[in-house]
């Protein structure tokens, strides 16, 4: 009679992450007599995975009734795979013995992949808020995947960036791999609306690649315009001169009014309008009463913005002219501050 | 008051490398942006580019072609200016300088950093 | 890149006259027009920023204006200590540039 062969038919299987692996192994004796065990991988570390005789194995269920007597199937299913559970699987004939079996042959191993999705890709961008014109970052990481192989793409608005630098970890063999990614992206003033997207492409995902998202709303800030303008005269005595606040973000914003370097006034913007780029506008105005002035005053319009340093225009309000007579502030009537101009 | 201090003069051979910082004192470091700026001898002045200690953001001229590298350290409130594959035409001295976040003129300068490559 | 062309290139003048340099931008750059001093050996100084706010500390016989593409720098009664080199810079768009110079000599 010819020497019983442990046969695993199958060189490797391919497993889906949370499926079941079937790990197939048919012995051609009945001779000798022994149980059957399987174990993941070779030597004297190998670990143990179901052992017919004795055990508690929660996961592992036989193909077959391994309690009857003509049976020689001792293929397993090991439930819910992770990507811990890749390795190469033997299975091991023993022969009955005294007080210990004894092993008697392997099969020559079956080797587990396990395919696992990667997690969706989490977008994160600079620490602070960044002006247009600048490039900032943004990183893309996805984890637990396998195979290696994985394809990341970055996109602005629909369109593909190429300033970027990815790296899957770890370089060498691994139950899971990681991918981290840099992108450099462009700010515009016209980003309030924008997104940035990282796109992962896996063999799991089956054409359909995972998306993770930042809004450039939480990145840009868009510094505001003034203009100080000196409008008709309401009263005889009175003057009334607005503050044109254009084109900011976020609406975070402080206006303080000078006279004179005293101030006069301090408001939050409230009832701002938003124009279609994202970017809000807002108007605020003082009304001046020249009676109460001897000599020219200066106006200063100041604002903070978003927690930045303060930034201001400046506007002379003549008072040795007629109210009447004034008009609009020109470029010659704007002076300076103690303040960074906005302009 | 405000200052900012720049690392002492360089001689550099062509192709090499150079380093220039410009530590920044008397501001809140993370709300100005810190530009670099060169003046050739006897010429006039060339932006290079600039970077917000906040946000690590960068704006360069792309006249360098990817030969400036700005990076700051928070910790020292330190930026630093590097250039690459140094050629004789980059003779010149290097200017740091001070501007409010978001398109605003450069109200502080440091005192300058003489960068010679020669071979 | 926007062209700043700054003229003249230098000119003469004697203490108590009234200089004028302009600044010719090649695009709209709105206000957003720096002037500043040079003295040999020496970091550039900010004058004026925004066309037309004095910086702190800068006397009031510098002056600003313009709008659009076409800025001016007055000194409207020359002193000793202005003879210098005078750059203007436009801050709208990068790259920032500058003017080529206008230097101020002694007549």
């Known amino acids: 009679e010819e020497e019983l062969q442990v046969i695993q038919p199958d060189k490797s299987v391919l497993v889906a992450a949370g499926e079941t692996a079937t790990l197939r192994c048919t012995a051609t004796s009945l001779i000798p007599v022994g149980p059957i065990q399987w174990f993941r991988g070779a030597g004297p570390g190998r670990e143990l995975i179901y052992n017919q005789k004795e055990g508690h194995f929660p996961r592992v269920t036989t193909v077959s009734d391994l309690t009857k007597r003509n049976n020689m199937d001792f293929s397993i299913r090991i439930g819910n795979i992770t990507p811990a559970d890749a390795g190469t699987y033997y299975c091991v004939k023993f022969r009955k013995g005294s007080p210990d079996d004894v092993e008697f042959k392997s099969g020559a191993g079956t080797e587990l992949s396990v395919r696992a999705k990667p997690s969706a890709p989490v977008v994160s961008g600079p620490a602070a808020r960044a002006t247009p014109q600048h490039t900032v970052s943004f990183t893309c990481e996805s984890h637990g995947f396998s195979p290696r192989d994985i394809t990341l793409k970055w996109f602005k608005n629909g369109n593909e960036l190429s300033d970027f630098q990815t790296n899957v970890d770890p370089v060498g063999e691994s139950v899971s791999y990681s991918i981290h990614s840099t992108a450099k992206v462009v700010l515009t003033r016209e980003d309030v609306h924008s997104q940035v997207i990282c796109e992962v492409a896996h063999v799991t995902l089956q054409g359909d690649p995972l998306r993770g998202t930042a809004n450039l709303s939480e990145t840009i800030r868009v510094p505001p315009t003034l203009e100080v303008t000196q409008q008709p005269v309401r009263a005889e005595n009175q003057v009334n001169v607005t503050c044109q606040v254009r084109k900011f973000y976020p609406q975070r914003l402080q206006l303080t009014w000078l006279e004179n370097g005293n101030v006069s006034r301090t408001e939050t913007a409230s009832t701002v309008t938003e124009n279609k780029d994202g970017t809000y506008n807002w108007m605020s105005w003082l009304l001046v009463n020249v009676s109460a002035h001897r000599d020219d005053v200066k106006l200063t319009c100041q604002v903070e913005h978003d927690g930045q340093p303060a930034v201001s225009k400046s506007h002379d309000l003549k008072v040795s002219a007629h109210p009447k007579e004034q008009g609009s502030n020109t470029a010659a009537e704007n002076t300076g501050s103690n303040e960074r101009n906005i302009y | 008051q405000v200052q900012l201090v720049q690392s002492g003069a360089e001689v550099k051979k062509p192709g090499a490398s150079v380093k220039v910082s410009c530590k920044a004192s008397g501001y809140t470091f993370t709300d100005y942006e810190i530009h670099w700026v060169r003046q050739a001898p006897g010429q006039g002045l060339e932006w290079m580019g600039d970077?917000?200690?906040?946000?690590?953001?960068?704006a360069n001229n792309q006249k360098f072609k990817g030969r400036v590298t700005m990076t700051r350290d928070t910790s020292t409130s330190t930026v630093y200016m590097e250039l690459s594959s140094l050629r004789s035409e980059d003779t010149a001295v290097y200017y740091c300088?001070?501007?409010?976040?978001?398109?605003?003129?450069?109200?502080?300068w440091g005192q300058g950093t003489l960068v010679t490559v020669s071979s | 890149d926007i062209q700043m062309t700054q003229s003249p290139s230098s000119l003469s003048a004697s203490v108590g006259d009234r200089v004028t340099i302009t600044c010719k931008a090649s695009e709209d750059i709105y206000d957003r027009v720096a002037w500043y001093q040079q003295k040999p050996g020496k970091a550039p100084k900010l004058l004026i920023y925004?066309?037309?706010s004095l910086e702190t500390g800068v006397p009031s016989r510098f002056s600003g204006s313009g709008s659009g593409t076409d800025f001016t720098l007055t000194i409207s009664s020359l002193q000793p200590e202005d003879f210098a080199t005078y750059y203007c810079q436009q801050y709208w768009t990068t790259p920032w540039t500058f003017g080529g110079g206008t230097k101020v000599e002694i007549k």
């Open positions: 925004g066309t037309a």
């Open positions: 970077i917000h200690p906040g946000s690590g953001g960068t």
């Open positions: 300088a001070r501007a409010v976040s978001g398109y605003y003129a450069m109200d502080y």
